[in-house]
């Protein structure tokens, strides 16, 4: 029951995370104009991975795609790639995890197959989340670098005069959406990996106790037996280690001077 819950929750968390990664990738507000020095501005600039937007005081907003591919920074291209890889891996992971869900029965799929699929989807979610976090973090680093470069340019004019036409950009909403979404996808992936351990068939060792009634005295012998789940080869109670104990089929124990009731 706990395994099903963990797997189901992992799937839902990852689904929300991947939806967030897609949303972040499509959003225009990756970087927004810094309004610290000029809170009441007639023009508000903001940019995404795919296009640049301007909102004017009248409320009119114009967005234009980046028509040049070579003119874009390599880091921006890298961020695009990371986000797309994250989405693709996440989507494949979701597809795999749907079939891996314990609550969904598909033919005569064994638990071992479902465990493998759960692990695969979990790893995919983890990598997807890491890609998103990495992409957003790289973009954030670019913004920080550009912000301080812009600030330096602002105050190093002729005789320290301030240049007015210098736009600085700060973190946009998409960055926070991306970080949270990447984190959720990562957590979902970890939960799927944990659920995989519970789904995988295991052989469990138990300490068994053998009681033999013999006349007026009872022999107590501690022993180790392997209780099989039916998946292993040990279907009969064969001795796995000799702790001085014997199976019921072996030599019958006789009373000795050390045996007391």
């Amino acid at each position: 029951m706990a395994v099903t819950a963990c797997q189901g929750l992992g799937f839902v968390v990852s689904l929300i995370g991947i939806a967030g990664i897609i949303a972040a990738t499509c959003m225009d507000q990756w970087s927004t104009q810094d309004l610290y020095n000029n809170p009441v501005t007639a023009v508000f600039n903001y940019q995404g991975l795919w296009r640049s937007c301007v909102r004017e005081s009248s409320g009119f907003t114009e967005c234009r795609g980046y028509f040049t591919l070579l003119g874009l920074p390599a880091m921006l291209q890298a961020v695009r790639a990371l986000m797309i890889v994250g989405i693709v891996l996440g989507a494949i992971g979701l597809l795999v995890s749907i079939f891996a869900l314990k609550c969904i029965r598909i033919g005569s799929m064994e638990d071992s197959a479902k465990a493998n699929m759960t692990l695969t989807s979990g790893i995919m979610f983890i990598v997807s989340g890491l890609c998103a976090i990495a992409g957003v973090s790289v973009f954030a680093n670019m913004l920080v670098t550009n912000f301080w470069m812009s600030t330096a340019n602002m105050y190093t004019g002729m005789g320290g005069m301030v240049q007015t036409v210098q736009t600085r950009y700060t973190f946009g909403a998409a960055l926070f959406v991306g970080w949270v979404a990447g984190g959720l996808t990562l957590i979902g992936g970890v939960m799927m990996c944990i659920a995989c351990r519970g789904l995988a068939p295991e052989e469990t060792n138990y300490k068994a106790v053998s009681y033999h009634a013999s006349g007026h005295s009872v022999a107590y012998k501690p022993g180790g037996f392997k209780a099989s789940t039916g998946f292993g080869s040990n279907t009969k109670n064969k001795k796995i280690y000799d702790g001085g104990a014997r199976t019921e089929d072996e030599v019958q124990s006789y009373p000795s001077k050390h045996d007391y009731v």
């Epitope: 023009v43 640049s52 301007v54 004017e56 009248s58 009119f60 114009e62 980046y66 003119g71």
Partner: nanobody
Framework: QVQLVESGGDLVQAGGSLRLSCAAS????????MGWYRQAPGKQRDMVAT???????TYADSVKGRFTLSRENAKNTIHLQMNSLKPEDTAVYYC?????????????????WGQGTHVTVSS
Amino acid sequence: QVQLVESGGDLVQAGGSLRLSCAASGSPFGFVVMGWYRQAPGKQRDMVATLTSSGATTYADSVKGRFTLSRENAKNTIHLQMNSLKPEDTAVYYCRAVLRSGDNWMAAANEYWGQGTHVTVSS
């Protein structure tokens, strides 16, 4: 450096016509919004007409039906055709433009204002 050059301001009789022009020089990468604003003596600056890059035009209620704002194709130049002028149209007319500085990443759009051109309508 981007500059807005205005022309066409003059003294005209009531009921007459004028054509104001505004050209954005300095090879900007296209405009977001361009328009005309006016400031009568002792009053605040008001919007007369604006044109967006999508082609939407907005007019102040006081000039609707009399003024027409147009754009010169492939140029960042706008023209304000003013017909049936009234004495209350007397003001300094300013050109305002929101222009992009580039098509690439991190290129911002900025607001620019012209020096103003005087329009006087005598009764």
